[in-house]
Interface confidence: medium
């Protein structure tokens, strides 16, 4: 039975040209996290595998940085980066948990960032 829940940064906004941290946190389960995938509309951005480390998709390597933690940092944001991002937690024995973040990249310099939390 899957008892866990994914907390995310929810809907967030950031300035064009800036950077943003995408973070998810899996709680309420003792399942072991074996891998976390970060995806954007069916495109794989990055993988963090418990055994093998980080893999950043070559097409995103110049604008995506691993971390902090299991999160992902997007850099040099463009308006085209606006959209849904998914953290997909592969766990044992529970299975797969998915979290959703919506990022809006603003032209304005007064982008208001959504609530953040620190991953313990």
């Amino acid at each position: 039975m899957m008892t866990g829940t994914i907390e995310t940064t929810g809907n967030i906004s950031a300035e064009k040209g800036g950077s943003i941290i995408l973070q998810c946190h899996l709680s309420s389960t003792t399942a072991q996290v074996t891998q976390v995938n970060w995806e954007q509309q069916d495109q794989l951005l990055a993988i963090c595998n418990a055994d093998l480390g980080w893999h950043i998709s070559p097409s995103f390597k110049d604008r995506v940085a691993p971390g902090p933690g299991l999160g992902l940092t997007l850099q040099s944001l463009t308006v085209n980066d606006t959209g849904e991002y998914f953290c997909i937690y592969h766990t044992y024995p529970d299975g797969t948990y998915t979290g959703r973040i919506f990022l809006e990249v603003l032209e304005s310099s007064v982008a208001e960032h959504g609530a953040r939390f620190q991953i313990p």
Partner: antibody, heavy 119, light 107 residues
Amino acid sequence: DVQLVESGGGLVQPGGSLSLSCAASGFTFTDYYMNWVRQPPGKALEWLGFIRNKANGYTTEYSASVKGRFTISRDNSQSILYLQMNALRAEDSATYYCARSTAWYFDVWGTGTTLTVSS
Amino acid sequence: DIQMTQSPASLSASVGGTVTITCRASEHIYSYLAWYQQKQGKSPQLLVYNAKTLAEGVPSRFSGSGSGTQFSLKINSLQPKDFGSYYCQHHYGNPLTFGAGTKLELK
């Protein structure tokens, strides 16, 4: 053109040492994990280990069968991957391939170099 | 370690025919499975990754399927150049392991 070319294979006595090289070209070497995979004559492929890319600090992982005897390193200025093999045994006889990995599947393979361990 | 079990070990088929090779993982690996083709005396070549995504330049007569622990590689309209050995490999954890291979021979 993306290319990997291994060299350094040959005949070695049991207990001996040998270093294999793999020259990479046609891609940004520092962006990729680089692996060694071997294949004994007429047998299956066996992953030996990898060295991570720049973003992951060039750290290494090894299979249990070679851990402590084999060492993977890389010269990023020359785009060369190395496999240092010590305390060689007859069962290490194989064709050795270097391979580039993307998300831990092997998308580019070298031509292979053959090691024979025999007295 | 995750063990990969391939079947059959060998099979023969005719040009124009269809074959299916299967691979079973000893643990759940989601869709993290790759298939390689290796011709005699040559290095392996990536055919499929993520269980069903064809590598660049691979003809559409090849198709991969499956998830979890059961996977298969299907080759339709067999061509003379398709004969050789095929290996599966999980790309999910350490150590990365291959199946023992399937030798596809001309009938």
